[in-house]
Each structure stands twice: as C-alpha cells, then as structure tokens.
C-alpha cells in the first residue's frame, strides 16, 4: 500500500489504482506542510516530512547561515529540510567556527579561506520566517501564501481556530512560536486569528467576534441551490449567492474544481485528535 503519492508515479512503484477510493481517509499533507523539499507522508496519526536527499560523497564543503559546516550543499539542504528552517550557504569551504550542533556538540573544522560568520540578529527568525535585514528593526518576514489552500477548519495548540493548516503554519511564523494542529474542526472557544500585512511582515489582529460568528456571517449571503442543481457539486455543498448568476460549490476537504470533482492531494486533511509531526 503506498505511503506517498510519489509511490504511484514511479514505473516500479506501487499499484495505486485504489488510492483515490479512500474517501474517508484523512490526510495530513498540503504543499505548505513540508517546506524545503521535504516529502510529506501521513502514517497513522503521524505526519512525517521525509528529507532523504540521497546526498553523494563529494567533498565540496560549505558553511551554512546557521554557522555549521556541511560536506556539500546537499547535506545543508537536507538539514534545512529536517529542521524545516532556512539555511543558506554563506560561503564555500567549512565555517571558520561552527555554531555547534543541535546536540550540543562543539565546533567543526575551519577553512583558511572563509572568515568567521558574524552573529546576526536575524538568527532569531524561526518557524519558516525569513529575515529582512534592510528593515530598521529586526523583522521576521513570513512569505507564506495560504490563498490557494482549501477551507478545512482546524483547532491549533494555541487554542485558536484556523481555516487550514497553512494558516497555522503562517501564524506560527508570524508569532514566532510553535503552533501545531490539535484537532479537526474549530476549537470550542476562540477569539483570535492572525493576518499578514501587505509588506509580508507579521501583524496580529484580534477580532471582536470569534471565528465561528465570522464564518456564520459570511454564509448569510449564500442560499441553498434550487433542487434542479442537485448533483451540481460532486463532493461539496451547492451555494447560491444573490450576487452571482451561477451557483458555486463549497468543496469538502480534499476536493477541488468548479464542481468539486477533483481529488485535491495538496489540501491538508486532519486526523481527529492530537497530531504528531515528525521529521526524518
């Protein structure tokens, strides 16, 4: 049985003829789940970002923006994937002084050709944030675009509801704190959501109404479709807006297209209950 869609795509891979039939399956992957070239797999209630890059044994040492040295650039990208954070090549050759490993190990070898990396205030940017060094203050810029991510309400570890996993990742980036998916559907009580300002810098907006009320008010403009539109939406609800000539489909999670006819593998479906994220 395939553990990822890529298994279906290889000539020697799994027979995935039944892959689309798992209507009740709750995936945990969208295009924003695993950044930095990681492959997202859902195994049980665990989301795994697989970062096996099959790096070769070439010795072309590089120094990463985290102050660590790598055998070659592939190892650096692999580390970025594993950590789900950006690591840039700041110089060829090993770092003059390593920042040390996450395990608390010391320094790595130095190269006479590279100068020591100056510690930057940008090092504080985490959770997918990129640093804008040109800003007067230290700005952690969150270039996470959730506009293409389907509606799939979730309750996050900060006790707030989000429209999809992408928004959770965006909020985590904006607040620079760890926020994870906790359960399917909206939280019982939540009052805050986050938005990104036009320049991409993070801002936080507290709404007077909670997200449930916002959603209800948004739906007041839609009326159910007339009966002759039965079957118009294959996997979703048909809605008619007074502003629109044609009815529209609010697709169920995991489906896309004008009539919700296409299986959408980029959307995040969530396993109910606590979800563990794991990087391997």
């Amino acid at each position: 049985f395939p553990t990822s869609l890529s298994d279906c795509q290889t000539p020697t891979g799994w027979n995935c003829s039944g892959y689309d039939d798992r209507e009740n399956d709750l995936f945990l992957c969208d295009t924003n789940t695993c950044k930095f070239d990681g492959e997202c797999l859902r195994i049980g209630d665990t989301v795994t970002c697989v970062c096996q890059f099959k790096c070769n044994n070439d010795y072309v040492p590089v120094c990463g923006s985290n102050g660590e040295s790598y055998q070659n650039e592939c190892y650096l990208r692999q580390a970025a994937c594993k950590q789900q954070s950006e690591i840039l090549v700041v110089s060829e050759g090993s770092c003059a002084t390593d920042a040390g490993s996450g395990s608390g190990d010391g320094v790595h070898e130095g190269s006479g050709e590279t100068s020591q990396k100056e510690t930057s205030t940008c090092d504080i940017c985490q959770f997918g944030a990129e640093c804008d060094e040109d800003a007067e203050d230290v700005w952690c810029v969150c270039n996470i675009d959730c506009s293409q991510t389907n509606f799939n309400p979730l309750c996050a570890s900060d006790g707030k509801s989000y429209d999809n996993a992408c928004q959770i990742k965006e909020a985590s980036c904006q607040k620079q704190e760890k926020i994870e998916v906790m359960s399917l559907g909206r939280c019982q009580d939540n009052t805050t959501t986050t938005t990104k300002s036009e320049d991409g810098h993070y801002a936080r907006t507290d709404y007077a109404e909670n997200a449930n009320k916002l959603e209800e008010s948004a739906r007041e403009h839609h009326i159910p479709c007339p009966e002759h539109y039965n079957g118009f939406c294959m996997h979703g609800k048909c809605e008619h807006s007074i502003n629109m000539q044609e009815p529209s489909c609010r697709c169920d999670a995991g489906y896309t297209g004008q009539h919700c006819e296409k299986k959408d593998y980029s959307v995040l479906y969530v396993v109910p209950g606590p979800v563990r994220f794991q990087y391997v």
Epitope: Q52, D58, E68, Q71, Y75, K82, D105
Partner: antibody, heavy 112, light 110 residues
C-alpha cells in the same frame, strides 16, 4: 573540537567476526558522510566505501562487497564497521572519517 | 573505478627546496566547475591529514607552503619551501563516484 574515537585493537582468528566502532563528537553527525579506509601493514590507503549518515545507506568499493558491513547508531553519533568470516589478509589498521577528520585507527590482527 | 597513478613513488628533497608530486587520473575528475581531487599527508602511526581539497583549496591550519593545482586528469601537489616536518607519505584521492587513493609518494628530506 571535532573528534572521531575508534574502538581498541582486536586480535581475531580466521573465520571470526569483528565489529569496530567510531564515535564522533564536536559536530553534527549527519552533516558529513562516514568513510572507512583500510591500511595493511606497510601499504597504502585503500578506500573501502562510505555510509550516508542521514539515510543509513552504505556504498562499498568493489573489493569490499560481501563480508563487510557499515552501520550506524545515529543517536549515539557512532558508525560501525563489521567484518565477517575474517581472513589473514584482513589484518590491517582501519580508519573511519572523511576528508578533514579521521579516527586514530583500529588495528585488527587476524591470526590462527 | 577511477585509477589514480602517483609519481614518483618516492623522492628526496633538500631542506628549503621544492617538492613536486604528480597524480594522474584514468579519467577526468573535473565536472560542474570543480575538480574533485584532494591531497593527504600521512605520517607513520597516524591517520591521514587533509592538506588540499578540490585540487587547490588549502585546508584550515595547513601551512601556505602547500599548494595544489590541476584539472581534468592531471594534478600536482607542491611543497615549497620543504621543511623537516614534511617528511611523510602523500596521497592523492578523488571524490567522484567511488573514491580511490593514489599509491602514495614517500617524501624524504635530505
């Protein structure tokens, strides 16, 4: 600082198995592959192969396919070389490491 | 496998003079703008020590009297001026495909 510390010398009989350890410290273990090199007494260096410390996938040079096995204990930043069915010609010093850093070497003596 | 042939097998150089060691590969080890040739020094009872990587890059802590050059199939290690502590065996090694070492060159200081 970076250190690769190998296990001590081994005296074995032909047909036995030996397992040499190589413990790395001072750097992130998965940032570099781990190579193994053989040096018979009075001879030159012979590259045996390497193991990808991230995926655990080993690659063996042609002369070292079959009786030789590389493995890892990533959580302990340790690599292993196991030689099965030892022969007299396996008598050598074995080095672990790669490029800029190497272990001190482990002498394996195979004698009846 | 790529075969590396070192020459000479041994040489004796006077203190302060230049030592030149050659390494020829059976096929090119240069690609994508890099020459994947490295040079090591080994003294008796010690592990190898990296001197030069990617044909011409001096490894950290290695004296500037060591230099490397070459591309494609022909590479050279130069030591100038030679000092007494340079007495050792020198190996070239490539890191394309399956790695191999050259046969080694033993440097003696006169």
């Amino acid at each position: 600082q970076i250190q690769l510390v190998q296990s001590g010398p081994e005296l074995k009989k032909p047909g036995e198995t030996v397992k040499i350890s190589c413990k790395a410290s001072g750097y992130t273990f998965t940032n570099y592959g781990m190579s193994w090199v053989k040096q018979a007494p009075g001879k030159g260096l012979k590259w045996m192969g390497w193991i990808n410390t991230y995926t655990g996938e080993p690659t063996y040079a042609d002369d070292f396919k079959g009786r030789f096995a590389f493995s890892l204990e990533t959580s302990a930043s340790t690599a292993y070389l196991q030689i099965n069915n030892l022969k007299n010609e396996d008598t050598a010093t074995y080095f672990c490491g790669g490029d800029a850093y190497w272990g001190q070497g482990t002498l394996v003596t195979v004698s009846a | 496998d790529i075969v590396l042939t070192q020459s000479p097998a041994s040489l004796a150089v006077s203190l302060g003079q230049r030592a030149t060691i050659s390494c020829r590969a059976s096929k090119s080890v240069s690609t994508s703008g890099y020459s994947y040739m490295h040079w090591y020094q080994q003294k008796p009872g010690q592990p190898p020590k990296l001197l030069i990587y990617l044909a011409s890059n001096l490894e950290s802590g290695v004296p500037a009297r060591f230099s490397g050059s070459g591309s494609g199939t022909d590479f050279t290690l130069n030591i100038h001026p030679v000092e007494e502590e340079d007495a050792a065996t020198y190996y070239c090694q490539h890191s394309r495909e399956l790695r191999t070492f050259g046969g080694g060159t033993k440097l003696e200081i006169k």
